[in-house]
Interface confidence: medium
C-alpha cells in the first residue's frame, strides 16, 4: 500500500514539473505510474530500453542519486549520467575558452609572420646597401647577410643561438672581404690564406670601432624582447589548451550528475538546478583550475608591461630595419682608418712585403634614401605597435577568465533564475539555501566529497610554466628612463660604465633585459660574453649586460622552442537539450 502511494506521489511530481516555471495549474488526470518520460529522455543518451526500469524501483543500489522513495533510475543509468555530465562539463569549458583561445592563436600567428616579414625587409635593405655602395663585396656580403638574418629568424623562434656570436660572425666574415676587395683590391690570390688572420685582426684591432658592440646591444635587446613576446603568446595558448582539455574527477562527475540529472530519477524533467547550488558545485569542480587565476592575471599584466616597453632599442622593427645604416657606418669607419689599419695588418698578417698597400675610394652616401626608409618604417612600426596594444587590451578583458569560470559555466548552463523553484541536488525547493542543502544531505554524498586535493598534475605543470614565463617577462621589463632617454647611438657606450677594463658589467648600457629583478643571475647560463679591456689585443667588445656572464641566473635566455600550434577545431556540443 505504501509503495502505491509513493508511486502516485512520483507521478504527481512528474506532472507538476511540466508547469515550471509558469503558474501552478490543476493537475491533469494521473497517467500510468511508469517511468515513460525518464525512459524517452534517457534513450537520447543511450539507445535501448534495458537500463531504465519500467516502473519506479527502490533504487537501493544507487550511489549518487540516493532516492527518498521509488526512483526511475538504475545503477547503469547513473553511470551513464556521470559520464555525460563530465563530457558536458568539458564541452562547456571549451566553449568558455574558445574566444580567448582564438584571440591568442590568431595573434601569435600574426606576430610571428610580421616579425618574419621585418627580418626579410631588413635583409633586403642590407643587401641593397651593399649592392649600391659596395658592389665588389656583393656576392660574399649577400651570403653573410643571409646567414645572419637566418640566424635572427631562428633566434626569434627559440633556437639556441648566441646573438653576440651572430654579430661577431657577420663582422668576422665581412672584414676579410672588405680588406681584400676594398682596401687592397689588387691583393694576389696567394694572399687569400690571410683570411683567418684577418678574422682575428678584426676583433684584436677593433677595425669596425664600437659598431659591432652597438649592434650587439641593439640586436640582442630587441630580439630577446621579441622572442619572449612570442614565447609568452605560445605559452598562453598552451595554458588554454591545458585547461581546455582537463578531465574532471569522478568526484566532480558525481556532483555534476546530482546537479544536472538526479532530478530526472524523480521524474522532475523540467526542473533546473539552483544558481547558488551550481556555483558551489562549479567552484568545487574547478578548484584546481581557479588556482591558475593569480598567475594568469600576472601573465597578462607582465605581458602588458613588456609590450609597453617594446620601442626604440627594444623594438626589433626599429633595430633591424635600421641595421643596414649601422653596418654602412661601420664600413665607413674602416675606410677612414684604412691607412693605419693596412700598415698594422700588413705586419700582423705578414704580407707587408708582398705589395704596396693602398686604400681605395669609397662612396660615402647611401643610394637608399634613409628618409623614405624611415617614414615607411615608422608606419610599419606603428601598425605592429598598435596591434600589440590592441591585443593587450583584448587580453585584459580576459584577466579574470579563470576566477570567473565557475560563474560563466553556470550562466551558460540551465539554472533557475533567482534561485526559486529549483533543484538543490536532493529535492525541489522554493528557494536555495546552501546551509539547508548541506543539512539535508548530512548522510549523503555531498559537497564535502570534493576534498581539496590540490590542482591536477597538468594544472600544476602549467602553473609552473606560467610562473616561469612571468619571471621572464619581469626580467624583460625595460628600463624606465635612464637608457630610453639617451640617443640610440649612445646605447652601450656610457662612459665609465662598462668599457674600462676586462671585467664584465651588469648594467653599463642601462638596466639590461636579461636582468631578473631581485633574482640571482649567477654563472648558471653564460649565454653571452663580454671582453672589456683598454689594451688592444683583446676580443671585440660585446654588449655590456646583455652578454655578460654573471653571478646571477640569466633567465632571459631560457630557450623553450616555440610549439607548433595545434589546429583549433573545437566542436562545442550543445547539451542543453539533455538537461533542459
Amino acid at each position: 500500500m505504501a509503495g502505491t502511494v509513493r508511486t502516485a506521489c512520483l507521478v504527481v511530481a512528474m506532472l507538476l514539473s511540466l508547469d515550471f516555471p509558469g503558474q501552478a495549474q490543476p493537475p491533469p488526470p494521473p497517467p500510468d505510474a511508469t517511468c515513460h518520460q525518464v525512459r524517452s529522455f534517457f534513450q537520447r543518451l543511450q539507445p535501448g530500453l534495458k537500463w531504465v526500469p519500467e516502473t519506479p524501483v527502490p533504487g537501493s543500489d544507487l550511489q549518487v542519486c540516493l532516492p527518498k522513495g521509488p526512483t526511475c533510475c538504475s545503477r547503469k543509468m547513473e553511470e551513464k549520467y556521470q559520464l555525460t555530465a563530465r563530457l558536458n562539463m568539458e564541452q562547456l569549458l571549451q566553449s568558455a575558452s574558445m574566444e580567448l583561445k582564438f584571440l591568442i592563436i590568431q595573434n601569435a600567428a600574426v606576430f610571428q609572420e610580421a616579425f618574419e616579414i621585418v627580418v626579410r625587409h631588413a635583409k633586403n635593405y642590407t643587401n641593397a646597401m651593399f649592392k649600391n655602395n659596395y658592389p665588389s663585396l656583393t656576392p660574399q656580403a649577400f651570403e653573410f647577410v643571409g646567414e645572419f638574418f637566418t640566424d635572427v629568424s631562428l633566434y626569434i623562434l627559440g633556437s639556441d643561438i648566441n646573438v653576440d656570436d651572430m654579430v661577431n660572425e657577420l663582422f668576422d666574415s665581412l672584414f676579410p672581404v672588405i680588406y681584400t676587395q676594398l682596401m687592397n683590391p689588387g691583393l694576389p690570390d696567394s694572399a687569400l690564406d690571410i683570411n683567418e688572420c684577418l678574422r682575428g685582426a678584426r676583433r684584436d684591432l677593433k677595425v669596425f670601432g664600437n659598431f659591432p658592440k652597438l649592434i650587439m646591444t641593439q640586436v640582442s635587446k630587441s630580439l630577446q624582447v621579441t622572442r619572449i613576446f612570442l614565447q609568452a603568446l605560445n605559452l598562453g595558448i598552451e595554458v588554454i589548451n591545458t585547461t581546455d582539455h582537463l578531465k574532471f574527477s569522478k568526484d566532480c562527475g558525481r556532483m555534476l550528475t546530482r546537479m544536472w540529472y538526479c532530478s530526472y530519477c524523480q521524474g522532475l524533467m523540467m526542473v533546473k538546478p539552483c544558481g547558488g547550488y551550481c556555483n558551489v558545485v562549479m567552484q568545487g569542480c574547478m578548484a584546481g583550475v581557479v588556482e591558475i587565476d593569480k598567475y594568469w592575471r600576472e601573465y597578462i599584466l607582465s605581458l602588458e608591461e613588456l609590450v609597453n616597453g617594446m620601442y626604440r632599442i627594444y623594438d626589433m622593427e626599429n633595430v633591424l630595419l635600421g641595421l643596414f645604416s649601422t653596418i654602412h657606418d661601420s664600413i665607413q669607419y674602416v675606410q677612414k682608418n684604412a691607412g693605419k689599419l693596412t700598415t698594422t695588418i700588413g705586419k700582423l698578417c705578414a704580407h707587408s712585403q708582398q705589395r704596396q698597400y693602398r686604400s681605395a675610394y669609397y662612396p660615402e652616401d647611401l643610394f637608399i634614401d634613409k628618409k623614405v626608409l624611415k617614414v615607411a618604417h615608422v608606419e610599419h612600426e606603428e601598425t605592429l605597435s598598435s596591434r600589440r596594444r590592441e591585443l593587450i587590451q583584448k587580453l585584459k578583458s580576459f584577466i579574470s577568465f579563470y576566477s570567473a569560470l565557475p560563474g560563466y559555466i553556470c550562466s551558460h548552463s540551465p539554472v533557475a533564475e533567482n534561485d526559486t523553484l529549483c533543484w538543490n541536488g536532493q529535492e525541489l525547493v522554493e528557494r536555495y539555501s546552501q546551509k539547508a542543502a548541506r543539512n539535508g544531505m548530512k548522510n549523503q554524498f555531498n559537497l564535502h566529497e570534493l576534498k581539496m586535493k590540490g590542482p591536477e598534475p597538468v594544472v600544476s605543470q602549467i602553473i609552473d610554466k606560467l610562473k616561469h614565463i612571468n619571471q621572464l617577462l619581469r626580467t624583460m621589463s625595460m628600463p624606465k628612463g635612464r637608457v630610453l632617454d639617451k640617443n640610440l647611438d649612445e646605447e652601450g657606450f656610457e662612459s665609465g660604465d662598462c668599457g674600462d677594463d676586462e671585467d664584465e658589467c651588469i648594467g653599463g648600457s642601462g638596466d639590461g633585459m636579461i636582468k631578473v629583478k631581485n633574482q640571482l643571475r649567477f654563472l648558471a647560463e653564460l649565454a653571452y660574453d663580454l671582453d672589456v679591456d683598454d689594451a688592444p689585443g683583446n676580443s671585440q667588445q660585446a654588449t655590456p649586460k646583455d652578454n655578460e656572464i654573471s653571478t646571477f641566473h640569466n633567465l632571459g635566455n631560457v630557450h623553450s622552442p616555440l610549439k607548433l600550434l595545434t589546429s583549433m577545431a573545437i566542436s562545442v556540443v550543445c547539451f542543453f537539450f539533455l538537461v533542459h
Epitope: N162, G496, D503, D511, F522, L523, D531, S539, T551
Partner: antibody
C-alpha cells in the same frame, strides 16, 4: 681609475658578528657585481658570495649560507659583508673584488677572532 | 663544485729563466659560447691578488707581455718567459664559469 677601499682590521670575540665595508670609486658602482673572497694566512682563496648592487640580489657559497649577509648602499657606492657567529677559523683576510674576472681587489681586511 | 688543481706547489726559478705553472679543472671550463672562463692571479707577499690573465689567454693592460696563458678545456698553463725578481709570490688559477667560482691552491714562485 677603479679603486676598492676596505675598512680597517677588526678584532672580534667568538660568536660575535663583523661587518666589513668596501667603498668603490672610479666606475659606476651599480654596473658590476661585487664579490667577496677570503684568505686564511698562508692559504688559498675562497669565494664567499656575490652581490648585485643594482637590485640587491645576492648569491652565497653554501659553506657560508646563513652566516654571511651582503648588502650595498648605492648612494655612497659601498658594499658590505657581514659575517655572524664568528669562530676562531674565521680569522682570515676578507677581500672585496669586482666580478667577473676579479681584475680589481680591495686591499683586504684582517678579521681576528679571539677570546 | 669545480676543483682546480695546481702544480707544482712550489717553483724555484733562476732569474731570467722561463717558468711554467699548470692548472687542471675537474670539468671543462669551455662554455658553449666558446669562451674559457679561466683566470690567473699573482699575489705578492702582503698584497692583494692581481689579475694576470683572464679567459685563458687574455692579458689585461699593465701586465707585462712575459706573462702568457694557454690551454683549453680542463688543462691550462701560465708561462713566464723570463722570470724577474718582482715576479716572486703565489700564483693562483681560478674559474668563474661555473657556480661557485673556485681557485687553485696556489703555486709559490721563488728565486733560486
Amino acid at each position: 681609475q677603479v679603486q676598492l677601499v676596505q675598512s680597517g682590521a677588526e678584532v672580534k670575540k667568538p660568536g660575535a658578528s663583523v661587518k666589513v665595508s668596501c667603498k668603490a670609486s672610479g666606475y659606476d658602482f651599480t654596473a658590476y657585481e661585487m664579490h667577496w673572497v677570503r684568505q686564511a694566512p698562508g692559504q688559498g682563496l675562497e669565494w664567499m658570495g656575490a652581490l648585485d648592487p643594482k637590485s640587491g640580489s645576492t648569491a652565497y657559497s653554501q659553506k657560508f649560507q646563513g652566516r654571511v649577509t651582503l648588502t650595498a648602499d648605492k648612494s655612497i657606492s659601498t658594499a658590505y659583508m657581514e659575517l655572524s657567529r664568528l669562530r676562531s677559523d674565521d680569522t682570515v683576510v676578507y677581500y672585496c673584488t669586482r666580478f667577473y674576472s676579479y681584475a680589481h681587489w680591495g686591499q683586504g681586511t684582517l678579521v681576528t677572532v679571539s677570546s | 663544485d669545480v676543483v682546480m688543481t695546481q702544480s707544482p706547489l712550489s717553483l724555484p726559478v733562476t732569474l731570467g729563466q722561463p717558468a711554467s705553472i699548470s692548472c687542471r679543472s675537474s670539468q671543462s671550463l669551455v662554455h658553449s659560447n666558446g669562451y674559457t672562463y679561466l683566470h690567473w692571479y699573482q699575489q705578492r707577499p702582503g698584497q692583494s691578488p692581481r689579475l694576470l690573465i683572464y679567459k685563458g689567454s687574455q692579458r689585461p693592460s699593465g701586465v707585462p707581455d712575459r706573462f702568457s696563458g694557454s690551454g683549453s678545456g680542463t688543462d691550462f698553463t701560465l708561462k713566464i718567459s723570463r722570470v724577474e725578481a718582482e715576479d716572486v709570490g703565489v700564483y693562483y688559477c681560478g674559474q668563474s664559469g661555473l657556480t661557485p667560482p673556485t681557485f687553485g691552491s696556489g703555486t709559490k714562485l721563488e728565486i733560486k
